[in-house]
């Protein structure tokens, strides 16, 4: 070994650089959380890019660059390190228009947090690990909300835009001339049943047990899905969604309750399927192969 | 294709009488808004003459008021128009529209459904 690499891998394998390398990191991360720095920031910001090139170079020197086995860009560690630097010089000194969006990979500094702390780099491995893993079981989800997303859809399709409609029209009002002319927010609480304070029309249904209009009301399909049009079964795209919502259990109960009083109340055996299968299984076989993955990873 | 079934058309003198019906009688018509008579005279515009909501109240043309009288017989999908102290002016071609919604058996549709109509002449 040539004498420039013996000093470059006794540096390397300091514990002081390491605690150096760990607190370039912290104060640059303190530094990017200020608002409006002060001009002075600037020749910090050169000294923390001079401290990671420095770093960059040693592993460099005491490795090699990329040929061999456990060279600097052979450890995927190292590439996080490299891309740092490399955007470092980019953002300083070549001009490329809109350099804001290329100062954002700064914040990629934080993340060589990682490489340093050992607890973390465990974690995060078991993460990348976990992930790898997850991917049979992602399979299995996809298709799963999939089948339940068709389901859905034939199903529930286009009931969420049954609304509870005026029983008393002007001489020359017609249905179909009420739904060319419907767009404020006014026109559909004229024409339309909706409860205190709700931001929807009133759902209801053409079958026995879905949910029925109040006296002067009749149930028509007609104007857009509630929620803005978000919440509907109109599409495969639509019903996915729908379906990972029920997956996730965000909000759920407010879809539940939509499409019940929409459909009727029988379709409430889909629902307790989409919960336990979705919710309550597939959820928790995600977790356990993370949990898994990082019992590997710490084995 | 939906259809609504009117009858009852014909020739009347002035002061005479109709009875025209309008039968949603398919199982496609699910519920309606309305169901009511419209008339367009040769040259003129298609007019509102009387509709009954589903819940029985009902709406008449100024024109018409006091002669005539719209029902409904829910059982059998129809609705009927009786026409009293016809006058000339009266004669035109009656339409019935079912304004409500519909079952293509994949989905529900709302909107309005016209009947071909029943030609009314009133003349001596």
């Known amino acids: 070994f040539s004498p420039l690499r013996r000093i470059s891998i006794k540096i390397l394998v300091h514990s002081l650089f390491s605690m150096l390398i760990m607190c370039t990191i912290l104060t640059n991360c303190i530094f990017m959380t200020m608002n409006n720095p002060p001009d002075w920031t600037k020749n910090v910001e050169y000294t923390f890019t001079g401290i990671y090139t420095f770093e960059s170079l040693v592993k460099i020197l005491a490795r090699g660059f990329c040929v061999g086995e456990f060279t600097f860009l052979r450890d995927p560690w190292n590439w996080l390190d490299f891309v740092v630097i490399v955007f470092a010089y980019l953002t300083e000194f070549v001009n490329l228009g809109n350099v804001s969006a290329l100062r954002t990979f700064r914040v990629l500094r934080a993340l060589k947090t990682i490489s340093v702390i050992p607890g973390l780099k465990t974690i995060v491995g078991a993460l990348i690990q976990s992930v790898k893993k997850l991917s049979d079981v992602m399979i299995l989800t996809v298709f799963c909300l999939s089948v339940f997303a068709l389901i859905g859809l034939q199903l529930f399709m286009g009931n969420l835009k049954h609304k509870c409609f005026r029983n008393s029209l002007e001489n020359n009002e017609t249905l179909e001339s009420i739904m060319n002319t419907l767009e404020s927010e006014e026109d559909f609480r004229k024409y339309f049943y909706y409860l205190e304070g709700s931001k929807d029309a009133l759902l209801c249904g053409f079958s026995t047990d879905s949910g029925q209009c109040p006296e002067g009301y009749t149930c028509v399909k007609i104007g857009r899905n509630p929620d803005y049009g978000y919440t509907s079964f109109d599409t495969f795209s639509w019903a996915f969604l729908a379906l990972f919502r029920l997956m996730t259990q965000d909000y759920w109960e407010n879809l539940y309750q939509q499409t019940l009083r929409a459909a009727g109340k029988t379709y409430m055996i889909f629902f307790v399927v989409v919960i336990f299968l979705g919710s309550f299984y597939l959820i928790n076989l995600i977790l356990a192969v993370v949990a898994m993955a990082y019992e590997e990873q710490n084995q | 294709e939906v259809q609504l079934v009117e009858s009852g058309g014909g020739v009347v003198q002035p002061g005479g009488s109709l009875r025209l019906s309008c039968a949603a009688s398919?199982?496609?018509?699910?519920?309606?808004?309305?169901t009511g008579w419209y008339r367009q005279a040769p040259g003129k515009q298609r007019e509102l003459v009387a509709r009954i909501y589903n819940e029985g109240n009902t709406n008449y043309a100024d024109s018409v008021k006091g002669r005539f009288t719209i029902s409904r017989d829910n059982a059998k999908k129809t609705v009927y128009l009786q026409m009293n102290s016809l006058r000339p002016e009266d004669t035109a071609l009656y339409y019935c529209l079912f304004s409500g919604t519909i079952s293509t058996g994949r989905e529900y549709r709302s909107g309005d459904y016209w009947g071909q109509g029943t030609l009314v002449t009133v003349s001596s």
């Open positions: 398919s199982r496609q018509f699910i519920r309606d808004v309305f």
